[in-house]
C-alpha cells in the first residue's frame, strides 16, 4: 500500500497559558525532500486552516511570522505547538502532511487531536 499514514495523539490538554503541544508522525512511502505540514481545525463539517509550514528534510520547520504555531522536525516526526488558545478554541485539530517533492505527491491526514482548553480563573484581588 502506497498511502501515507499520519499518527497524532487522540487528546491533548492545553496549559493554563493556552499552549498545546503534540507530535505528528508520518510513515513516508517515498523519499521526500520537501514536506508541507498543515494544522486544520474541524468543527462540525467545517475545516479551517490554523497554520502551515513547508520545510526541506533536515532543515527547521518555519511558520509565517504571524502564525500561532511553532514546530520542530526530526526525521518523519514533527513536534507542533499551538499558542494563544482559549476555551472557545477547544476542538479537533488535524495534522495534514504533504510530500511535495520529488514526485509523486502524497497526502497524509491524521485522525485529529482533540485539544481541550480551559480558560484560567482570574486572579483574586489581593490586599497588601
Amino acid at each position: 500500500c502506497k498511502a501515507m499514514h499520519v499518527a497524532q495523539p487522540a487528546v491533548v490538554l492545553a496549559s493554563s497559558r493556552g499552549i498545546a503541544s503534540f507530535v505528528c508522525e508520518y510513515a513516508s512511502p517515498g523519499k521526500a525532500t520537501e514536506v508541507r505540514v498543515t494544522v486544520l481545525r474541524q468543527a462540525d463539517s467545517q475545516v479551517t486552516e490554523v497554520c502551515a509550514a513547508t520545510y526541506m528534510m533536515g532543515n527547521e520547520l518555519t511558520f509565517l511570522d504571524d502564525s500561532i504555531c511553532t514546530g520542530t522536525s526530526s526525521g518523519n516526526q514533527v513536534n507542533l505547538t499551538i499558542q494563544g488558545l482559549r476555551a472557545m478554541d477547544t476542538g479537533l485539530y488535524i495534522c495534514k502532511v504533504e510530500l511535495m517533492y520529488p514526485p509523486p505527491y502524497y497526502l497524509g491526514i491524521g485522525n485529529g487531536t482533540q485539544i481541550y482548553v480551559i480558560d484560567p480563573e482570574p486572579c483574586p484581588d489581593s490586599d497588601f
Epitope: 500500500c1 502506497k2 498511502a3 501515507m4 499514514h5 512511502p29 520537501e34 508541507r36 498543515t38 486544520l40 475545516v47 479551517t48 486552516e49 502551515a52 513547508t54 488535524i94 495534514k96 504533504e98 511535495m100 517533492y101 514526485p103 509523486p104 505527491y105 502524497y106 497526502l107 491526514i109
Partner: antibody, heavy 118, light 108 residues
Framework: QVQLVESGGGVVQPGRSLRLSCAAS????????VNWVRQAPGKGLEWVAV????????YYADSVKGRFTISRDNSKNTLFLQMNSLRAEDTAVYYC???????????WGQGTLVTVSS | EIVLTQSPGTLSLSPGERATLSCRAS???????LAWYQQKPGQAPRLLIY???SRATGIPDRFSGSGSGTDFTLTISRLEPEDFAVYYC?????????FGPGTKVDIK
C-alpha cells in the same frame, strides 16, 4: 461563496497552442491547490494537472506531460493551462477544480470546451 | 498509478429504489483518500463523499459511502428523480490522481 470560472476554450488546429484561464473568487486562493480536469465528449473524467499553493510544485498526467504547463497568479486569483502541440485526443471540456483542505475536489467551474480539429 | 474500476457500468432502477455502486482499486487506497462525485448532463461534477464515508456540505443523508482497502461502495438509500446521473469514484492520496470510468444510474 466559492466560484471558479474558466475561459479561453475554442476550436484549434492540431499542433497549435491554446491558453485556458480560471478566475477564482470567494476564498483565499493562495491557500489551496487547484487542478485541471478534462472530459472528452461522452467520456469520463480525466485528471490533467495540479498546482500547489505558491506555484512551485506542479504535477501532470502522463498524457499531457511535456506539452501542457499549469501555472497560477496568486495576486490575480487566476489559474492557467498553457496547451501546446495539441492533438485531436485533447478535445474535451476542461474544468478547473479546487482541492479541499482534506484532499477531494470540492468546487468546480462550469468548464470550457476545447476542440482540436483541422 | 492506481487504477479504479467501477461496476456496474449502468444501473437501471426506479425512483424509491436503493442503488449500490461499487469502486475497486488496483492497489490498496487508504479510506481517507477516496471520493465520490455526481455529474448530470451538461453540468460540472459535484463532490458527494470524501474520506470514503464523509458527506460533503449540503449532501442529503440518503447518500452514504463505505469501504476500505481496495473495495468501496456508494449507496443511495432511496432514489429521488434528481439522483439519476453518472457517479465517479476518485483517489486523491497520491499523484497521479485517478477517476473511475463512472456508473450511470438511469430510470428503468
Amino acid at each position: 461563496q466559492v466560484q471558479l470560472v474558466e475561459s479561453g476554450g475554442g476550436v484549434v488546429q492540431p499542433g497549435r497552442s491554446l491558453r485556458l484561464s480560471c478566475a477564482a473568487s470567494g476564498f483565499t486562493f493562495s491557500r489551496f491547490g487547484v487542478n485541471w480536469v478534462r472530459q472528452a465528449p461522452g467520456k469520463g473524467l480525466e485528471w490533467v494537472a495540479v498546482i500547489w499553493y505558491d506555484g512551485s510544485n506542479k504535477y501532470y498526467a502522463d498524457s499531457v506531460k511535456g506539452r501542457f504547463t499549469i501555472s497560477r497568479d496568486n495576486s490575480k486569483n487566476t489559474l492557467f493551462l498553457q496547451m501546446n502541440s495539441l492533438r485531436a485526443e485533447d478535445t474535451a471540456v476542461y474544468y478547473c477544480a479546487r482541492v479541499h483542505q482534506l484532499g477531494p475536489f470540492d468546487s468546480w467551474g462550469q468548464g470550457t470546451l476545447v476542440t482540436v480539429s483541422s | 498509478e492506481i487504477v479504479l474500476t467501477q461496476s456496474p457500468g449502468t444501473l437501471s432502477l426506479s425512483p424509491g429504489e436503493r442503488a449500490t455502486l461499487s469502486c475497486r482499486a488496483s492497489q490498496s487506497v487508504s479510506s481517507s483518500y477516496l471520493a465520490w462525485y455526481q455529474q448530470k448532463p451538461g453540468q460540472a461534477p459535484r463532490l458527494l463523499i470524501y474520506g470514503a464515508s464523509s458527506r460533503a456540505t449540503g449532501i442529503p443523508d440518503r447518500f452514504s459511502g463505505s469501504g476500505s482497502g481496495t473495495d468501496f461502495t456508494l449507496t443511495i438509500s432511496r432514489l429521488e428523480p434528481e439522483d439519476f446521473a453518472v457517479y465517479y469514484c476518485q483517489q486523491y492520496g497520491s499523484s497521479p490522481f485517478t477517476f473511475g470510468p463512472g456508473t450511470k444510474v438511469d430510470i428503468k
